[in-house]
């Protein structure tokens, strides 16, 4: 069964900067990736970025840079402009779509005890969808 992993990382040099890393483990080619925060896509989450493997990326503030790391993983840099850091307690979700086979989504967050620069362990909460 395909799986999605999510890691959230706080930058050591800038505590207001976060990076979300997401990857797809499974067969098949990815046709679209959507990244949201505050919950899963279509279930209360707010869209941060959409990435197409060939046609490019689209992103919305506070997303700073969305890019492909490999054919099956992406990263999204976020800039927190607020005085406090709401990202620290936020859930980030990534949905990998393989049209028309199906889509797979997982969510993760930065553990409250995380030190700057350390990645959150890959403990995804899988939300499996059979489209």
């Amino acid at each position: 069964t395909p799986e999605v992993w999510v890691q959230v990382q706080m930058e050591a040099t800038e505590l207001s900067s976060f990076t979300v890393h997401c990857g797809f483990l499974g067969p098949g080619s990815i046709s679209l990736v959507t990244v949201s925060w505050g919950g899963p896509d279509g279930a209360g989450g707010t869209k941060l970025a959409v990435l197409h493997p060939e046609l490019g990326t689209r992103q919305w503030a506070p997303a700073r840079q969305a890019r492909w790391e490999t054919q099956s993983s992406i990263s999204l840099a976020l800039e927190d402009s607020g005085a406090s850091s709401p990202f620290a307690n936020t859930t980030f979700c990534c949905k990998f779509a393989s049209f028309p086979e199906g889509s797979w989504e997982s969510c993760g967050s930065l553990p409250p005890s995380s030190d700057p620069g350390l990645s959150a362990p890959p403990t995804p909460v899988p939300i499996l969808r059979a489209d």
Partner: nanobody, 121 residues
Framework: EVQLVESGGGLVQPGGSLRLSCAAS????????MGWFRQAPGKGLDEGVA????????KYADSVKGRFTISRDNAKNSLYLQMNSLRAEDTAVYYC??????????????WGQGTQVTVSS
């Protein structure tokens, strides 16, 4: 949760017509386009057969221009595809999808289970 349910497929003779419908529910989707895509037996997925974006811009694949018409009813949260002058090569599973535009092309993010269209005498 976005749910898209297609209907209206079936068996039709060459030259005949069909009207596909797609009902959307739980529609909190924030994309900017919807459309119809198809996958023929033993073949890869076609680029959008017919797509429409939030501004109402419509795009058809060359192979269906003049024969297929896409429309939507926002009040009913529905998408339609009127297919006329059907040909054997139109035989495929047709998917209703909601997605995002990249360079004018609609890329699916959510889609239904598909409905089979078979054109044969």
């Amino acid at each position: 949760e976005v749910q898209l349910v297609e209907s209206g497929g079936g068996l039709v003779q060459p030259g005949g017509s069909l009207r596909l419908s797609c009902a959307a529910s739980g529609f909190t989707f924030s994309g900017d386009c919807m459309g119809w895509f198809r996958q023929a037996p033993g073949k890869g997925l076609d680029e959008g057969v017919a797509t429409i974006d939030n501004a109402g811009r419509i795009k058809y694949a060359d192979s269906v221009k003049g024969r297929f018409t896409i429309s939507r009813d926002n009040a009913k949260n529905s998408l339609y595809l009127q297919m006329n002058s059907l040909r054997a090569e139109d035989t495929a599973v047709y998917y209703c999808a909601a997605g995002w535009t990249f360079g004018g092309q609609c890329s699916p993010a959510d889609w239904g289970q598909g409905t089979q269209v078979t054109v044969s005498s």
